[in-house]
């Protein structure tokens, strides 16, 4: 005698995050008298997800209507999908029973797969300016996508990376994964305006990756380099001396003047100009009033860099000599001092 | 649907009613029989499924057997009493979200010595 | 097992009449719902007219209709017309398959 078969005809389907998952399934009979249920798993932990006869299922829908007569479609849909949904789903055949209705025929299942996007890429970069010749390290970070096959890379300034390390968690079966890589990359002092890219590719963003940037203006920092300079007379007993600032970035900046050693003027780097690569120029200058020294005197520009030791260079000013014209190179070459840096 | 096999019989001897169908499947619905003594109400006596989806009320239970074939739906009075004199009726369905319908016109069963 | 109780057993009204049949189970009825109301005429099989306590079956005029749920279930006629003075069974179903029992019966006649 033929009896009832509970028929799921999709052994598997496929479903965006958000999206809408029909489940179908149909009975052969109307006999036994009882209640189709819906299951996620199988077993005794296994999840009700719909129950004909009672409950309050809110995002699911049946597709026909169960009150009807003679219906034999029991297919449900599940409403705004996320990754926690994905498993295999059975449809069974209770037969009406005292004090409780009796399982009497289960589905074969249908495995719910559910396609979620990756978050946006988040990168980060180190702590810690570096500079120069420094390697440093950035990280990105992607979470939430299904299935877990997924595609990152890694470029500067649009030229792709290779130094890099990536791993996709958990590495057995889940509802989402997450993707975690660590790139390494050389700074140059050209990289102020200079950008890190992390490219996700996966097959629920169709073709078009998803991007996270970092600027390595935040990550670098270009020490400046000094040079002090001696002016022509500008009064009979007057000599201005500049020190001139050149390619630092941040701006953040402290210069202090000494005259012998002795702290002469400090000020902070304001009107300053910017170079085509982003770093950026400064220039001080001091007046000193020969007259006022009976004994040669030397002159220290010393700059404090974002926070870092300080650096310097000093200028030898004879006050015997008449003063004249110095050239581009620093007083301390010309008259054999030496040159100060002080970490 | 439709009864036939109702006649008058005596106490004791088995009596088969058929209820013939057409327009639907027997492996898909049930046939529920409920009778009617004259001049009382309805009295449901049972379903006839698959062989392991029969089933009696409790107080038809080895008074009355039931049988398939693939149009046809047996009932049978194992052993009738006077009380099981009445208008006995097939019909499509088992209860619940398949309830009776439609109903055959019924056929008579008289139990008398 | 279950036992339905259906009231009035008979009552006389006039067409056009708003009519009211109570029906009550000594338990609820399976899902809570598992309750049909039946219309008898002398001489011929009953009919299908409410299922589900309160689905409209095929073809049944939209005066009829059905509410309760549980134990206390009742069929309503709207607007009395001639050709439904009859006799009115409720049918419950317990929570055992074979426990399917009908009420006694209400016959509505005509004033």
């Known amino acids: 005698e033929e009896e009832l078969q509970v028929i799921q005809p999709d052994k598997s389907v496929l479903v965006a995050a958000g999206e809408t998952a029909t489940l179908r399934c149909t009975a052969t009979s109307l006999i036994p008298v009882g209640p189709i249920q819906w299951f996620r798993g199988a077993g005794p932990g296994r999840e009700l997800i719909y129950n004909q006869k009672e409950g309050h299922f809110p995002r699911v829908t049946t597709v026909s209507d169960l009150t009807k007569r003679n219906n034999m479609d029991f297919s449900i849909r599940i409403g705004n999908i996320t990754p926690a949904d994905a498993g295999t789903y059975y449809c069974v055949k209770f037969r009406k029973g005292s004090p409780d209705d009796v399982e009497f025929k289960s589905g074969a299942g249908t495995e719910l797969s559910v396609r979620a996007k990756p978050s946006a890429p988040v990168v980060s970069g180190p702590a810690a300016r570096a500079t120069p010749q420094h390697t440093v390290s950035f990280t990105c970070e992607s979470h939430g996508f299904s299935p877990r096959d997924i595609t990152l890379k890694w470029f500067k300034n649009g030229n792709e990376l290779s130094d890099f390390q990536t791993n996709v968690d958990p590495v057995g079966e889940s509802v989402s994964y997450s993707i975690h890589s660590t790139a390494k990359v050389v700074l140059t002092r050209e990289d102020v305006h200079s950008q890190v890219i992390c490219e996700v590719a996966h097959v629920t963003l169709q073709g078009d990756p998803l991007r996270g940037t970092a600027n390595l203006s935040e990550t670098i920092r270009v020490p400046p380099t000094l040079e002090v300079t001696q002016q022509p007379v500008r009064a009979e007993n007057q000599v201005n001396v500049t020190c001139q600032v050149r390619k630092f970035y941040p701006q953040r900046l402290q210069l202090t003047w000494l005259e012998n050693g002795n702290v002469s003027r400090t000020e902070t780097a304001s009107t300053v100009t910017e170079n085509k690569d982003g770093t950026y120029n400064w220039m001080s200058w001091l007046l000193v009033n020969v007259s006022a020294h009976r004994d040669d005197v030397k002159l220290t520009c010393q700059v404090e860099h974002d926070g870092q030791p300080a650096v310097s260079k000093s200028h030898d000013l004879k006050v015997s000599a008449h003063p004249k014209e110095q050239g581009s190179n620093t007083a301390a070459e010309n008259t054999g001092s030496n040159e100060r840096n002080i970490y | 649907v439709e009864e036939s096999g109702g006649r008058l019989v005596t106490p004791g001897t088995p009596l088969t009613l058929t209820c013939t169908v057409s327009g639907f499947s027997l492996s898909s619905h049930g046939i529920s029989w409920v009778r009617q003594a004259p001049g009382k109400g309805l009295e449901y006596i049972g379903t006839i499924g698959t062989g392991v989806i029969t089933y009696f009320a409790s107080w038809a239970k080895g008074r009355f057997t039931g049988s398939k074939t693939s149009t046809t739906v047996d009932l049978k009075i194992t052993s009738p009493t006077t009380e099981d004199t009445a208008t006995y009726f097939c019909a499509r369905g088992s209860a619940w979200n398949d309830p009776f319908d439609p109903w055959g016109p019924g056929t008579l069963v008289t139990v008398s010595s | 097992e279950l036992v339905m109780t259906q009231s009035p057993s008979s009552l006389s009204a006039s067409v056009g009449d708003r009519v009211t049949i109570t029906c009550q189970a000594s338990q609820s009825v399976y899902g809570n719902n598992d309750l049909a109301w039946y219309q008898q005429k002398p001489g011929e099989a009953p009919k299908l007219l409410i299922y589900l306590a309160s689905t409209l079956a095929t073809g049944v005029p939209s005066r009829f209709s059905g509410s309760g749920s549980g134990t206390d279930f009742t069929l309503t006629i709207s607007g009395l017309q001639s050709e439904d003075f009859a006799t009115y069974y409720c049918?419950?179903?317990?929570?055992?398959?074979?426990?399917?029992?009908f009420g006694q019966g209400t016959k509505v006649e005509i004033k």
């Open positions: 049918l419950g179903g317990g929570d055992d398959e074979a426990d399917n029992v």
